[in-house]
C-alpha cells in the first residue's frame, strides 16, 4: 500500500462544499479551512477524512499496489481498502508487501490452515500437533541440511 504525495488542497475549488465547524472541528468527509471558519468537503476518490478533525487538508487516498486487489474504493469518509491477491498474504507485523504463500508443509507436518490474504498456510507436527513458525521448504522441495544446521523453529 502506498500513499500519494501529500499536498494542501486548493481551498476555493468550486466543487468543494463548505459548512461551519462545530467546536473547532469538521465532520468526517471534510477538513478545516486555514482561517478556521469553514469546513471544506474532501474530493471523492482523491482524499478523505474518517473522523471529526481539525486537519488543514484531507488525507490522500491510498492506491493499491500491484499484487493487491481493491476491495472497496476511497470515498470522502473512508480510505481505499486493499487486499493481497489470492495465493499471497501480508501479516500485520510484516513489511508492507504481499508475500507468496507456501505451497505445502515440510515433511512430518500436516496443513491445518489455508492461505488467506492475512496469513500463510499453517502447519503442525503430525505427532505433537505443535505449530511451525518461520520459513520452511515446501513439501515438494528436497530438505537437505549439512551437519550442524539448526532445525527450523517450532512453537
Amino acid at each position: 500500500i502506498t500513499q500519494q504525495d501529500l499536498a494542501p488542497q486548493q481551498r476555493a475549488a468550486p466543487q468543494q462544499k463548505r459548512s461551519s465547524p462545530s467546536e473547532g472541528l469538521c465532520p468526517p468527509g471534510h477538513h478545516i479551512s486555514e482561517d478556521g471558519r469553514d469546513c471544506i468537503s474532501c474530493k471523492y476518490g482523491q482524499d478523505y477524512s474518517t473522523h471529526w478533525n481539525d486537519l488543514l487538508f484531507c488525507l490522500r487516498c491510498t492506491r493499491c499496489d500491484s499484487g493487491e486487489v481493491e476491495l472497496s474504493p476511497c470515498t470522502t469518509t473512508r480510505n481505499t481498502v486493499c487486499q493481497c491477491e489470492e495465493g499471497t498474504f501480508r501479516e500485520e507485523d510484516s513489511p508492507e508487501m504481499c508475500r507468496k504463500c507456501r505451497t505445502g508443509c515440510p515433511r512430518g507436518m500436516v496443513k491445518v490452515g489455508d492461505c488467506t490474504p492475512w496469513s500463510d498456510i499453517e502447519c503442525v507436527h503430525k505427532e505433537s500437533g505443535t505449530k511451525h513458525s518461520g520459513e520452511v521448504p515446501a513439501v515438494e522441495e528436497t530438505v537437505t541440511s549439512s551437519p550442524g544446521t539448526p532445525a527450523s523453529p517450532c512453537s
Epitope: Q3, D54, L55, L56, F57, L59, R60, T62, E92
Partner: nanobody, 126 residues
C-alpha cells in the same frame, strides 16, 4: 525497543478536567502519528483521538469531540490528552499507542497500532 508510559490518570468529579501524558522512548516518535485509546471494564478498546506526526491536525471520536484535545511535543517525545467536561462514561483505562506500520497517515483503528503503553486509569465519579 518501543516503550510508552502514560501518566496523569486519577479520580475526578463529573465536569472536571484531567491532562494525560505519554512519554515515548523511541527515536521515530517525531515522525509517526500517535493515538489515544481507552478501554472501559467489560468493553472493547476504542479509539479516542490521533494526531499527525507534525502535530498539525488530529482526529477525534464522536464521543469526545469538543471536550478532549490531543497535542504533542516532539522535542520531549511526549503526547498529551487534555480532557475537559468529564463524564461518568469517560471512566476507562487510557492507552497511548504508536502504529505498527507507516501505510496510514492518521490511523484510527486498534489493529493499525502495534505498540501500546500499560495504560492509566481515569475514574469519573462523584
Amino acid at each position: 525497543e518501543v516503550q510508552l508510559l502514560e501518566s496523569g490518570g486519577g479520580l475526578v468529579q463529573p465536569g472536571g478536567s484531567l491532562r494525560l501524558s505519554c512519554a515515548a522512548s523511541v527515536s521515530t516518535f517525531g515522525t509517526s502519528p500517535v493515538g489515544w485509546f481507552r478501554q472501559a471494564p467489560g468493553k472493547e478498546r476504542e479509539f479516542v483521538s490521533a494526531i499527525r506526526w507534525d502535530g498539525v491536525g488530529a482526529y477525534y471520536a464522536d464521543s469526545v469531540k469538543g471536550r478532549f484535545t490531543i497535542s504533542r511535543d516532539n522535542s520531549k517525545n511526549t503526547l498529551y490528552l487534555q480532557m475537559n467536561s468529564l463524564r461518568a462514561e469517560d471512566t476507562a483505562v487510557y492507552y497511548c499507542a504508536l502504529p505498527r506500520r507507516g501505510d496510514s497517515e492518521l490511523p484510527s483503528t486498534v489493529k493499525e497500532y502495534g505498540y501500546w503503553g500499560q495504560g492509566t486509569l481515569v475514574t469519573v465519579s462523584s
